[in-house]
């Protein structure tokens, strides 16, 4: 229903705390370079204004859209052009073009230093002195680095952060308590960031229909006892919510997400038997819990999928009457039977089924033509199953770091033109799939592996789109979202690539490497590995192993030496010479 004042409506629905958090996230995602202090000032101004509208919905400007109000605030920032260049041009536009312009200027790889976690003691001191400000900084720092982070979910992670600090800051060994807990929150949040970016990419590039298909498949897997109309209702709502968040309508998105959680909890009987535990929680936790809910048990008496979609003589008639509904019911029926498949695979199968009907329903004997369609699914199913098998075997053999290195070599050979930092980031993330998925029960591996890889490859595509350098990457990224992962998997060594010259400085290291945390040390080594492959794209596994082993020994030896600097200075050139020789 229409409200006189949109901002008053959202403030009342969300409450002051969540309202302020969401406004802070919105501003931080739009203007990623502004300091926290500047954003928090704007947040307070918007909040004060919202309160005046709550008191009197007819007050001046209260009838303006939230985009108009937020945009006016952002455009009033002094020195906007100095700090943001052409983003300031957006301010000359009217809504809705102005908001579209802001969205187009979101930077997926902002030039910001990696977020450094302070020492445990310092963290606890600043948290205890001002928890609101401390958590505000957290929202700001995450949101500006991840401009598409799902805002209501970020509020949830801030709440988790708060819980961990509240608990650990009273312990004697604060660091021992904080480190593993905050690492777990960080890991979950980073995965959430790439997953949401994929959803926004899907929405931006392929529209609501594609996203809704994704949602139907996912919901059908989770809620196999719900009817098709119920699944479609949930998928429609989830599509709307994600469209809002991806579009910067964070208040509406969070409000609608809370509404959906309420609806699901009021209609458990028609959705799933697994919801009750989630429904007893407060709003942010409730929504998050519902988003992560385990699959309901598949009904025991489901008939074969062939009955309605292959053997029925009316298939073409049913398809013609309402293509989207018929294909939707196919996707629903197939997905509810296959929680062991990835959503990407289910969408590939639905696409294959649609293409088969398009072809066969125009022919003389449609049933004979589409009669083999389910058998034709087999190669599509086998391909990702083999991918999971081979990659999990490799992961089990090499461990996470070794597996990341294998992936890094593979991807540097596929796309050597891509910048080394991007390749290292992608390979490290792709390599984590082993730890994340290969330890799961067999039935959960495929959906975990493929849907995670798809999200990571989307990040690679988003970064590559900014500065396209590889035709092969462009080709895989331009196609359909569900075909991306198979496209990347099928890439081989890029034969057109002219190897990089060997530059000694690329492989010159200093004693500062010794004091780096393990993660940073790994990144240094992986950077060297990618550069080696760019120099020798056809180097054998044994050659690379020799050089990297030699390199690891060299670092180890010099870091243990009494005069580290001298060791690096004298041993370094020898290492470079040996490496060149080994790769010759």
């Amino acid at each position: 229903e229409a409200h006189k004042s949109e901002i008053a409506h959202r403030f009342k629905d969300l409450g002051e705390q969540h309202f302020k958090g969401l406004v802070l996230i919105a501003f931080s995602q739009y203007l990623q370079k502004c300091p926290y202090e500047e954003h928090i000032k704007l947040v307070q101004e918007v909040t004060d204004f919202a309160k005046t509208c709550v008191a009197d919905e007819n007050a001046e400007n209260c009838d303006k859209s939230i985009h108009t109000l937020f945009g006016d605030k952002l455009c009033a920032i002094p020195k906007l052009r100095d700090n943001y260049g052409e983003l300031a041009d957006c301010c000359a536009k009217q809504e809705p073009e102005r908001n579209e312009c802001f969205l187009q200027h979101k930077d997926d790889n902002p030039n910001l230093p990696p977020f450094q976690r302070p020492e445990a003691e310092a963290m606890c001191t600043s948290f205890q002195e001002n928890p609101t400000s401390f958590l505000g900084h957290y929202l700001h720092e995450v949101a500006r680095r991840h401009p598409y982070f799902y805002a209501p979910e970020l509020l949830y992670y801030a709440e988790k952060y708060n819980e961990v600090l509240t608990q650990c800051c009273t312990e004697s060994d604060k660091a021992a308590c904080l480190t593993p807990k905050l690492d777990a929150v960080k890991e979950k949040a980073l995965v959430a960031a790439v997953r949401q970016r994929m959803k926004c990419s899907s929405m931006q590039r392929f529209g609501e229909r594609a996203f809704k298909a994704w949602a139907v498949a996912r919901m059908s897997q989770r809620f196999p006892n719900a009817e098709f109309a119920e699944i479609t209702k949930l998928a429609t709502d989830v599509t709307k919510i994600n469209k809002e968040c991806c579009h910067g309508d964070l208040l509406e998105c969070a409000d609608d997400r809370a509404e959906l959680a309420k609806y699901m909890c009021e209609n458990q009987a028609t959705i799933s038997s697994k919801l009750q535990a989630c429904c007893d929680k407060p709003v942010l936790q409730k929504s998050q819990c519902l988003a992560e809910i385990e699959h309901d048990n598949i009904p025991a008496d489901l008939p074969s999928i062939a009955a309605d979609f292959v053997e029925d003589k009316e298939v073409c008639k049913n398809y013609a009457e309402a293509k989207d509904v018929f294909l939707g019911t196919f996707l629903y029926e197939y997905s509810r039977r296959h929680p062991d498949y990835s959503v990407s695979l289910l969408l590939r199968l639905a696409k294959k089924y649609e293409a088969t009907l398009e072809k066969c329903c125009a022919e003389g004997d449609p049933p004979a033509c589409y009669g083999t369609v389910l058998a034709e699914f087999q190669p599509l199913v086998e391909e990702p199953k083999n991918l999971v098998k081979t990659n999990c075997e490799l992961y089990e053999k090499l461990g996470e770091y070794g597996f990341q290195n294998a992936v890094l070599v593979r991807y540097t050979q596929k796309a050597p033109q891509v910048s080394t930092p991007t390749l290292v980031e992608a390979a490290r993330n792709l390599g984590r799939v082993g730890t994340k998925c290969c330890t799961l029960p067999e039935a959960q591996r495929l959906p975990c592996v493929e849907d995670y890889l798809s999200a990571i490859l989307n990040r690679l595509c988003v970064l590559h789109e900014k500065t396209p350098v590889s035709e092969k990457v462009t080709k895989c990224c331009s196609g359909s979202l569900v075909e991306r992962r198979p496209c990347f998997s099928a890439l081989t060594v890029d034969e057109t690539y002219v190897p990089k010259e060997f530059k000694a400085e690329t492989f010159t290291f200093h004693s500062d490497i010794c004091t780096l945390p393990d993660k940073e040390k790994q990144i240094k080594k992986q950077t060297a590995l990618a550069e080696l492959v760019k120099h020798k794209p056809k180097a054998t596994e044994d050659q690379l192993k020799t050089v990297m082993g030699d390199f690891a020994q060299f670092v180890d030896k010099c870091c243990k030496a009494a005069d580290k600097d001298n060791c690096f200075a004298t041993e370094g050139p020898n290492l470079v010479a040996r490496s060149k020789e080994a790769l010759a």
Epitope: E227, A229, T232, K233, D237, D308, T329
Partner: nanobody, 117 residues
Framework: EVQLLESGGGLVQPGGSLRLSCAAS????????MGWVRQAPGKGLEWVSL????????YYADSVKGRFTISRDNSKNTLYLQMNSLRAEDTAVYYC??????????WGQGTLVTVSS
Amino acid sequence: EVQLLESGGGLVQPGGSLRLSCAASGFTFNHYTMGWVRQAPGKGLEWVSLIHPSGTVIYYADSVKGRFTISRDNSKNTLYLQMNSLRAEDTAVYYCARWSSRAFDYWGQGTLVTVSS
């Protein structure tokens, strides 16, 4: 017994508007997804739209998107179809139907909509 009674059809000029209504009885209306289906002269059935009991629209045919709006009033057991920017190709008998699980199980008698100048 289940009854669905459509009304609101008639003759309208291209570009004009009509609002169809469907009065439902004999079942718990707010438990069912409802829809509109049409059949143009000499053609097969075409599903126009579906609406979930909660009021969430879950389907529009591409041919009517942006022009037709389905809605329902559960307190009045009534389904509506607001049709704007009507075209000659929208000429058809419009049926109100109840959706059950996988298909429509009850239909009304239909109301004729003719778009012509």
